[in-house]
Amino acid sequence: EVEKTACPSGKKAREIDESLIFYKKWELEACVDAALLATQMDRVNAIPFTYEQLDVLKHKLDELYPQGYPESVIQHLGYLFLKMSPEDIRKWNVTSLETLKALLEVNKGHEMSPQVATLIDRFVKGRGQLDKDTLDTLTAFYPGYLCSLSPEELSSVPPSSIWAVRPQDLDTCDPRQLDVLYPKARLAFQNMNGSEYFVKIQSFLGGAPTEDLKALSQQNVSMDLATFMKLRTDAVLPLTVAEVQKLLGPHVEGLKAEERHRPVRDWILRQRQDDLDTLGLGLQG
């Protein structure tokens, strides 16, 4: 807390400008009007304030807006956002994607902080669902964002948003998450066909049931090993040797290198040795 002291004569700030960097903390507290600060927040980022000075500015805004900052202020917080606690952010009502982008930009290049996680949570809850534009924005800043959500949270993702998902956005998703995303992807891409469809759905196949894999095995898809290794073990186990051979096409030779890893290892153990021998890869069941 900064003590309440009168502003020295002639030091009353009429605008937020570079002269303020020479103010001591108590002078900032006494001489900068909170309402002025709020209307000129966009100028704060252009001025090289110290962390201690930023603390004072935050304190002034907190006093002016005890129930939480309005979006007009939030959008221009800039580096002052890094001073906010999750508790501060929970008071906010952020509805504009532009505001979200502006604040994510401040944290760019860093891991997702608790502040950012809280901000995103507030934003998504305010929107009611994770729409395509929001997902586009979030995955651009945090490629692992989608996989950080629980299956319950993912269930609120509308199928139309799936178009914004890139393969790398799914790299860290576990089977439970892909179980939720796969039906959404099927719905999103259902009017595509041929190789175009397979390219789009491929990243989501970790949530595919056995029946879909069996159907694909009859359609010359030539699934790569990286995709095969991400399939659900329980979906792969019922596949016959012939089905896996047709599913992988020329990539079937890659099974040898993966024979000790799931789901290949578990699948091999389920097969008759005679059937495995037809592949000519030396796989031992």
Partner: nanobody, 128 residues
Amino acid sequence: QVQLVESGGGSVQAGGSLRLSCAASGNVYNNMCMGWFRQAPGKEREGVASMYVGGGYTYYDDSVKGRFTISRDNAKNTLYLQMNSLKPEDTAMYYCAAISIALTREFCAPIVSRYNYWGQGTQVTVSS
């Protein structure tokens, strides 16, 4: 997963009509195939008619062309087979089936081995 339940079978005189229905529950997508198959006692199961759910493709076996019509009500998630001018040789157990993913419409041809979801069947008996 898709569950298929047929209804509408029964006994009819030659020349009569029947309409079979197949209610699908679970996830049905445009790039799936649905079709009708039949199996007469002592015979192999054979394809009757099939379609691409998203439209643009229907197939009929030569033996039913001009007499049977396959259709689908998307809102009700139901597949139909309208059978007119029935003959005694149409007597069989009729099955509704689906392919869970079709990369091309032509893959929907009613080939038994391609279809991976099946209903329990409904009996159709045509007497002369």
